[in-house]
Structures are given as C-alpha cells and as structure tokens.
C-alpha cells in the first residue's frame, strides 16, 4: 500500500482540519487506514482520525481539534495498520480555509435596490471575525453567461445593488464566499445559493 | 468590562502547596483561552500555564510541569492554578491573563492585578 | 524553544524622543508578536499585536513594525507617562516566550 498524493490539510482556524490526499491503488480508507495527530508539545495526547473515500483513490479526513490557536502544532502520521505510510507536520494557523459565510437572504422590498445579507461564519472571539472580506456570485438562471462577481472589502456582510443593472422578469441566484487577508487564506467553500425573482420594471419615462 | 481578579497567594514552605483562583467578568469565559504568567521580583514575564477554552487542552512551562495543575470551572468563571512541591524560584508574582481573540491566545489584551506567592523557610 | 532577545537592555531618552527597542526571535515567527508595556507595580499592558497592529485605546505614536525574526517597537514622542518596561513575547510556537525586557527611562 503506497500514499500517491501525500496528505494537504486545510484548518477553519476554530476546531476542524480537513486533510486529504490521494492512495496508489483503490483503497477503503475506513478500513484500512488511520491518521494520528498529535499537538507538538511535551508529551501531549494522540488522537486518532478515520478517513472516508472521497473517490476511487482519495481519502478525506475531519480532525477535530480543541480550539485551535495560533501557536498550535501538529504532528501527522497516516498508518495502514502497522505500516507508516507517511509522517508530516501541519501548522493550523497558517493553511487556513475560513468557514462558508451561511444564512445568505435576498430582500427584494426595498425600492430599486436588491439586498443581499449574510451571517459571518465565527463568532466574535475569533480574530477571523473582523478579518473577512467576502465574494458574492450573482447569475441569471436561464443563461449562465449573464454572471457577475461582487467583491465586499467592508466588514459589514451585506450588499446592495440597483435592481436596475439585472434583467426585469429574470429569476437570479447568488452565493458567497469568504477570505481572511491577514492570513492570506484559501477562499471557504460558496454558501448555498439562494433564488429570488427580479420583478424590477424601469420608470416609464424611462422605457 | 473585561475583570480578572487573583487570590490565593501567600507565604508557604518549600514543598508546600497552594491554589491559586481567577475569578472572570465582563466577557462570555467558556470561549477563551486562559493562561498564568509570573513574574519573580525584579525579573521579567514568564509563562506559566494555558488552559484551552473546552478544558480539554492544558500546557504548562518545562519548569512547572508536574508539579503545577491548570483548571476551569466554565460555571463559576473562575481559572485555577494548583500549585504543589513549591520551591524558592517559584516566588513570584503569578497573573492571570486573556487573550484579545480565542485563537491569538497569547496576545493578552486583559490581565489581573496579580497575587504574590512566597516560597520560603 | 524559541528565544527572544532584546535591545537594549535599558535606555534613557528625552521627552519628545523617537524611542526605538528591538527584539528578535531565534527562528522566524511570521507575524506573531506582541509588545507590552508594564509600568513599576501594575500589570502589563498590551500595546501591539500581530507585530504591528495596534491594540484598543493605545496611543497613537506606539507602533510596531518587522516580520520573521526581526522586530521593532517604536515611541514616536517620548511622553512622562512612557516610562516603563517593554517587553515582546511570541505567540508563534509553544511554548509562549517573553524577551528579557527594556527599561525606558526619562532622561
């Protein structure tokens, strides 16, 4: 049993790393594989991590972490029973993946204006909380060309834009996804998307 | 506003033992990170003890471990330090410290006034 | 461990000096360093964060500056009420280490 892709692993900076990497041949990761961490300091407790198959060859693994700090360090070994099949080390703080922003809601009673709200994914006891910047993805449902991107370098997690600069009588979707500058993360995962119709009409005078 | 207030400290035997408290206010404790610096008089900070904020992580300075033990108890706000088989260098005074955010757990924006612990025959 | 090593010791400097205290760290910490400010008899108190980011409420003329292992503690104009030990400390790797201090003295 051979480790093709060796493990990269990803942290929210709150309790959960995800580490994935890829076998040399089909493998139940459940069953035949375990990867041990352990936090790099005196003689700190060993945890243990099942992996799932994420495809033929890939394996996915959710460490669970007791609140991860900045100066945290750990030790990574995969092992298929007896036989280490890999040792490395993983930094949290500095491979880190924010959480997707959630709660994401169109309110559409606003005159002119489309506005789009979001919760931010920590709480405010995580320096992540004031360090977001957010991307909210825009498109047309019936023609997946018509797509913008709007980037939100505020804190504030919402955005208004003129009902006008979408299509009347078009139902749209939106998403968003959220990265931390300070340390230089990975963008999270989109949100699930939400619908809403834009039943928008120009003035006459203006038509 | 954040508070943090220390007691416990006092004059004990080489060998002896003391529990130290911290008792919390003006922020939600369960959430944070909470750690004890010392300071021996006229030296400088050293680091003591972390306690993560579900309790389930506890670190301690080589000079301590073994004999020094970190706890919370979420319910009452208070963070404890028990310290046992106390020598001379351990004379010191000992505060308690918060960090700004959870995951900066050594940027203590809040810190006790601090109790004083004196190890001597 | 990772050692963190202050310059200078001590100093004395006039009012409405640039005050500069360095400190540096045996391998690199990124960005991970704090400065502090303990006055004679009180508790320390947080100046900066992040190396360079400045904490709620603190003066204007601190301000810090570095990444790596090279740092700086800057006093724009030295005020009476700066007069103090300054200490950085890493948050990079357990364990937390503290420099050995600077005592700034009014001349």
């Known amino acids: 049993m051979k480790v093709l892709q060796e493990p990269t692993c990803v942290s929210d900076y709150m309790s959960i790393s995800t580490c994935e990497w890829k076998m040399g041949g089909p493998t139940n990761c459940s069953a035949e594989l375990r990867l041990l961490y352990q936090l790099v300091f005196q003689s700190s407790e060993t945890h243990t991590c099942v992996p799932e198959n994420n495809g033929g060859v890939g394996c996915v693994c959710h460490l669970l972490m007791d609140d991860v700090v900045s100066m945290d360090n750990y030790t990574l070994d995969l092992w298929a029973g007896q036989q280490l099949l890999w040792k490395g080390s993983f930094k949290p703080s500095e491979h880190v993946k924010p959480r997707a922003p959630g709660n994401l809601t169109v309110h559409t009673n606003v005159s002119d204006t489309v506005l789009l709200t979001w919760s931010n994914p920590y709480p405010p006891d995580n320096y992540l909380y004031n360090d977001l910047t957010y991307a909210v993805n825009i498109w047309n449902e019936n023609d997946l060309a018509d797509s913008r991107i709007h980037n939100v370098t505020y804190l504030k997690p919402t955005l208004r834009i003129p009902a006008s600069t979408l299509k009347s009588g078009i139902s749209y979707r939106a998403r968003v996804r959220a990265w931390a500058q300070h340390y230089n993360t990975t963008w999270s995962e989109w949100s699930p998307s939400t619908k809403w119709y834009n039943s928008y009409r120009e003035p006459f005078e203006q038509r | 506003q954040v508070q943090l207030q220390e007691s416990g400290g006092g004059l004990v035997q080489p060998g002896g033992s003391l529990r130290l408290s911290c008792a919390a206010s003006?922020?939600?404790?369960?959430?944070?990170?909470l750690t004890w610096v010392r300071q021996a008089p006229g030296k400088g900070l050293e680091w003591v003890s972390t306690?993560?904020?579900?309790?389930?992580?506890?670190l301690y300075a080589d000079s301590v471990k073994d004999r020094f033990t970190i706890s919370r108890d979420n319910a009452k706000n208070t963070l404890y330090l028990l310290v046992n088989s106390l020598k001379p260098e351990d004379t010191a005074v000992y505060y308690c410290?918060?960090?700004?955010?959870?995951?900066?757990?050594?940027?203590?924006?809040?810190w006790g006034q601090g109790t004083t612990v004196t190890v001597s025959s | 461990d990772i050692q963190m090593t202050q310059s200078p010791s001590s100093l004395s400097a006039s009012l409405g000096d640039r005050v500069t205290i360095t400190c540096q760290a045996s391998q690199s910490i990124s960005s991970y360093l704090a400065w502090y400010q303990q006055k004679p008899g009180q508790a320390p108190k947080l100046l900066i964060y992040g190396g360079s980011r400045l904490q709620a409420g603190v003066p204007s003329r601190f301000s810090g500056s570095g990444s790596g292992t090279s740092f700086t503690l800057t006093i724009g104009g030295l005020e009476t009420e700066d007069l103090a030990t300054y200490y950085c400390q890493q948050d990079y790797s357990w364990p937390l280490t503290f420099g050995q201090g600077t005592k700034l003295e009014i001349k």
């Open positions: 003006g922020f939600t404790f369960s959430s944070y990170s």
């Open positions: 306690i993560k904020a579900r309790g389930g992580t506890t």
């Open positions: 410290a918060k960090p700004l955010y959870n995951n900066l757990a050594g940027d203590f924006g809040s």
